[in-house]
């Protein structure tokens, strides 16, 4: 807390301007008037004030707005911004993109803070929505913006929003995140033609389901190892040897050097080695020739 | 033109005060901030502080606080810096610069004033 | 104490390309506009860089300024012998009010 003291003659600021940085805290408090920096808040970031003097002038901002700031204020709050804390900013009500943009501007090339984050919580709860503009916006700061969202909050984006997503966002997405952002994802591009649809869908392609795989390998698709590798296990082991042949095209090749990971692997252990044997590549632990293929899956329904 | 001019040399003795001078031409000496930066021999800058010529307002960077004293003459526009309690460490090329407004550059400098502070 | 670190040297053949970085913190370079002065052996330093990446008129193209998170980097290309001299990346600081670089010998070989 700064103490109340008597603003010094001729010190009474009459605007926000350079000529504070040379103000003592107790000084900044006392000549300051809070309704004139509510006002001029634009002008606070040009000006270099130290972080002992911001913490003033946001002291002064908590007692004139205690229910949290207006958005005439939190658009022009600069490098303030960075003082806030999570609690501060659950009080405030930020509707306008611009607004948004200015204070990720703030915190751009950091790690996202607390303080982004909540902000950003704050923003979405607010349109009741990720709609196009906000998700480009959020993932053009932070790209791993979308897959630090659970499921549950990713059912709330519209497919539309799904055009504003570019493959590097969705590089720390997990499966469960991409099972819900597919169906989104093949909705939005489904008027595409064949090689561009793939081009939009291949990097949602970690939630797509068994069916969708069989049907993408009859279009000649050339799907490289690296987005292969990515595939939900349970989609590609009941695809045959053909079909994984007509999926990858030449990429197949790389099928070698992956025989030890997940979902090569256990896709290989499903497959008569006769069938892997067309493909040339040596790969070995397939079900020897004479031995019955059991589907697991068909006996327990049946049972 | 913008031009800064500080005063010549000087040598002083270990526990002396030492005034450096810098006069302001090519533009209304109050509208720009005056800051001083020194260089000790085969060394970086170091800011030391900065006057409102306007107001005489100043704020000195921590090291120095309660050795040095900025002021300003608007008469004869010009700036001046005392250091006391000189000690060897204080030899340097002492610099004024002006500070622009707005982006906080330093725009134009002074040729510098060597002090030699020795026995 | 100096709170921008640069390289204490670098060095380059006529005609190649340079740079020189400065990394900060979030209370300096995180947050406030980065410029670069050149120091030729015995003058006064000489603005080169402002706001992040300006050039003051007469400062020729082959130097240029970027920044990213908490650093920045001086950018020097088609190296020429009269650019051999001291660099110096400068911002303010929020905690100090006002900083340097340790500086950066730049030596033009051959």
């Known amino acids: 807390e700064v103490e109340k003291t008597a603003c010094p003659s001729g010190k009474k600021a009459r605007e926000i301007d350079e000529s504070l940085i040379f103000y003592k805290k107790w000084e900044l408090e006392a000549c300051v008037d809070a309704a004139l920096l509510a006002t001029q808040m634009d002008r606070v970031n040009a000006i270099p004030f130290t972080y002992e003097q911001l913490d003033v002038l946001k002291h002064k901002l908590d007692e004139l707005y205690p229910q949290g700031y207006p958005e005439s204020v939190i658009q022009h709050l600069g490098y303030l911004f960075l003082k806030m804390s999570p609690e501060d900013i659950r009080k405030w009500n930020v509707t306008s993109l611009e607004t948004l943009k200015a204070l990720l501007e703030v915190n751009k090339g950091h790690e996202m803070s607390p303080q982004v984050a909540t902000l950003i919580d704050r923003f979405v709860k607010g349109r009741g929505q990720l709609d196009k503009d906000t998700l480009d916006t959020l993932t053009a700061f932070y790209p791993g913006y979308l897959c630090s969202l659970s499921p549950e909050e990713l059912s709330s984006v519209p497919p539309s929003s799904i055009w504003a997503v570019r493959p590097q966002d969705l590089d720390t997405c997990d499966p469960r995140q991409l099972d819900v952002l597919y169906p989104k994802a093949r909705l939005a591009f489904q008027n595409m033609n064949g090689s561009e649809y793939f081009v939009k869908i291949q990097s949602f392609l970690g939630g797509a389901p068994t069916e969708d795989l069989k049907a993408l390998s009859q279009q000649n698709v050339s799907m490289d190892l690296a987005t292969f590798m990515k595939l939900r296990t349970d989609a590609v082991l009941p695809l045959t040897v053909a079909e994984v042949q007509k999926l990858l095209g030449p990429h197949v090749e790389g099928l070698k050097a992956e025989e030890r990971h997940r979902p090569v692997r256990d896709w290989i252990l499903r497959q008569r080695q006769d069938d892997l044997d067309t493909l040339g590549l040596g790969l070995q632990g397939g079900i020897p020739n004479g031995y019955l293929v059991l589907d697991l899956s068909v006996q327990e329904a049946l049972s | 033109q913008v031009e800064l001019v500080q005063s010549g040399a000087e040598v002083k003795k270990p526990g002396a005060s030492v005034k450096v001078s810098c006069k302001a031409s090519g533009y209304t000496f109050t509208g720009n901030y005056i800051n001083w930066v020194r260089q000790a021999p085969g060394q970086g800058l170091e800011w030391m502080g900065i006057?409102?010529?306007?107001?005489?307002?100043?704020k000195y960077a921590q090291k120095f606080q309660g050795r040095v004293t900025m002021t300003r003459d608007t008469s004869i526009s010009t700036a001046y810096m005392e250091l006391s309690s000189l000690r060897s460490e204080d030899t340097a090329v002492y610099y004024c610069a002006r500070w622009h407004h707005g982006t906080w550059i330093f725009d134009y400098w002074g040729q510098g004033t060597l002090v030699t502070v020795s026995s | 104490d100096i709170v921008l670190t640069q390289p204490p040297s670098v060095s380059g053949a006529p005609g190649q390309r340079v740079t020189i970085s400065c990394s900060g913190s979030s209370s300096n370079i995180g947050s406030n506009y980065v410029s670069w002065y050149q120091q030729l052996p015995g003058t006064a330093p000489k603005l080169l860089i402002y706001n992040d990446n300006q050039r003051p008129s007469g400062v020729p193209d082959r130097f240029s300024g970027s920044k990213s998170g908490t650093s920045a980097s001086l950018a020097i290309t088609g190296l020429q012998s009269e650019d051999e001299a001291d660099y110096y990346c400068s911002t303010y600081d929020r905690r100090t009010f006002s900083v340097f670089g340790g500086g950066t010998k730049l030596t033009v070989l051959g």
């Open positions: 006057i409102n010529p306007h107001g005489g307002d100043t």
